[in-house]
């Protein structure tokens, strides 16, 4: 902590501009009224202050403002919001888009992946819902950042906002975050015909149900193994060969690079040899022929 | 004192184009959102366009005003909106409203400017 | 876009009562609404924003509540120069609310 000591007359502070830079950090802490600097942040982000002297100017606002910053003060942070942590933006309230486009742009080449996450939830939660004006800031400004909102905040996503998602926006969701989007894709994407259904709603598969993946193979999509191998674990084991071979078509050659991988793997475990046989890959670890398979869950479910 | 004027209505035919302006005088005009508002006769308020007056530059528009209206920042103290395509519905008193740094509060307000459009 | 409904219009009054109008958000907005009062031949004056905060120089007799989808403009000891249409808008910035206000409620007062 920066010790307290008192201004000299000569270094007093009437507005915030370059002259500061040459304040030692003491000085900054003594000198540098909260209240100025709060009224004049946006001047702070054209004075190319060190790190040390801006931790005493967040010190500062942090005094000012110990229950979280107001907006038209978060609005010019600048640089000095790589100083804060997830802690300090989760106190904020932040509705507006200039707000989120002003922070994502400082943010940009460092490494503040949880401050942008806890941002945007904050911006979700101060504007009721992820509306689409937020997603269209999101995808242009931080591509990704939409999958670092946990599946709760996404749920408040609108399904008529959907079709403002691109597919890169959704390279790094995890599966329970798709699972949240799918459905919500899916509804939004209803009236649309096979082909263009399936391009549209490729991206959330990776939350799609079995009865979907199955529904999916009766329609000559010809699934790519990307794709593919984004799918549910669960939703791909219960499919048969011949189900997989429709499904992929073209591509079903694929599963041999893939065959020990996740879920192909697994769902070759499942398969009777003699069905892997019929599709011509050599894909080998199926059920040896003349095995009988008991379904010990359904057992014990039963008794 | 802070003042918001519009200038540019009137009386133009079906199919014209029309610019109006917004003529800031005692007011600060950056890190602002300057908006226009529409009313018909005798109907309610109908937003327009708005634009960021500051960093981002950033433009929003209704979906019904998309192609046809184009807002731009002038001046350092005037903002204007291009209307092309003009037809009776338009007719309306078109406000120049100011909100804040960060959201749609219209604290001050143009007295508006009538354009008819008829043949 | 989001859709902002009001109810109910005309709402009439007499002096010294009291008067609710309600404005309602397709979709969940928080606080993020405002009330304007207007009346003839005058741009809208700006009474309440952030759905509950008294604008300055308004009088303490406009009160606003409400949060999410569901608001209320509340004006208690009516006097006759109340009488003004009065509008909802949700003020958050982006495409979507730039168009955000209610149809409008005419007040009467008796």
């Known amino acids: 902590d920066v010790e307290r000591t008192t201004c000299p007359p000569e270094k007093e502070v009437h507005e915030i501009d370059e002259s500061l830079i040459f304040y030692k950090k003491r000085e900054l802490e003594a000198c540098v009224d909260a209240a100025l600097l709060a009224a004049q942040m946006d001047r702070v982000d054209a004075i190319p202050f060190t790190y040390e002297q801006l931790d005493v100017l967040k010190h500062k606002l942090d005094e000012l403002y110990p229950q979280g910053y107001p907006e038209s003060v978060i609005r010019h942070l600048g640089h000095l919001f790589l100083k804060m942590s997830p802690e300090d933006i989760r106190k904020w309230n932040v509705t507006s888009l200039e707000t989120l486009k002003a922070l994502l742009k400082v943010s940009k080449g460092h490494e503040m992946s949880a401050q942008v996450a806890t941002l945007i939830d904050r911006v979700v939660v101060g504007r009721g819902q992820l509306d689409k004006d937020t997603v269209d800031t999101l995808t242009a400004f931080c591509p990704g950042c939409l999958c670092s909102l946990s599946p709760e905040r996404l749920s408040s996503v609108p399904p008529s906002v959907i079709g403002a998602v691109r597919p890169q926006d959704l390279d790094t969701c995890g599966p329970r975050q798709l699972d949240v989007l799918y459905p919500k894709a899916r509804l939004a994407f209803q009236n649309m015909s096979g082909s263009e259904y399936f391009v549209k709603i490729r991206p959330f598969l990776g939350g799609a149900p079995t009865e979907d993946v199955k529904a999916l193979s009766q329609q000559n999509v010809s699934m790519d193994l990307a794709t593919f191998m984004k799918l549910r674990r669960e939703a791909v084991l219960p499919l048969t060969v011949a189900e997989v071979q429709k499904l992929l078509g073209p591509h079903v050659e694929g599963l041999k690079v893939e065959e020990q991988h996740s879920p192909v793997r697994d769902w070759i475990l499942k398969q009777r040899q003699d069905d892997l046989d019929t599709l011509g890959l050599g894909l080998q670890g199926g059920i040896p022929n003349g095995y009988l398979i008991l379904d010990l869950s359904v057992r014990e479910a039963l008794s | 004192q802070e003042q918001l004027v519009e200038s540019g209505g009137g009386l133009v035919q079906p199919g014209a184009s029309l610019t109006l302006t917004c003529t800031a005088s005692g007011i600060d005009f950056s890190r602002y959102y300057m908006c226009w508002v529409r009313q018909a006769p005798g109907k309610g308020l109908e937003g327009i366009a708005c634009?960021?007056?500051?960093?981002?530059?950033?433009t929003y528009y209704a979906s019904w005003a998309k192609g046809r209206f184009t807002i731009s920042k002038a001046s350092s103290t005037t903002v204007t909106l291009q209307m092309t395509s003009l037809t009776a519905a338009d007719t309306a008193t078109y406000f120049c409203a100011r909100g804040t740094n960060l959201n749609y509060i219209f604290r001050l307000w143009g007295p508006g400017t009538l354009v008819t459009v008829s043949s | 876009d989001v859709v902002m409904t009001q109810t109910p219009s005309p709402v009439s009054a007499a002096v010294g009562g009291t008067v609710t109008i309600k404005c309602q958000a397709s979709q969940s907005i928080n606080n993020g609404l405002a009330w304007y009062q207007q009346k003839p031949g005058q741009p809208p004056r700006l009474l309440i924003y952030s759905a509950s905060n008294l604008e300055s120089g308004v009088p303490s007799r406009f009160k606003g509540s409400g949060s999410g989808t569901e608001f209320t403009l509340t004006i208690s000891d009516l006097e006759c120069d109340d009488a003004a249409t009065y509008y909802c808008q949700c003020i958050w910035d982006g495409n979507s609310y730039v168009n955000a206000f209610g149809g409008g409620t005419e007040v009467v007062v008796r």
């Open positions: 634009i960021y007056i500051g960093g981002s530059g950033s």
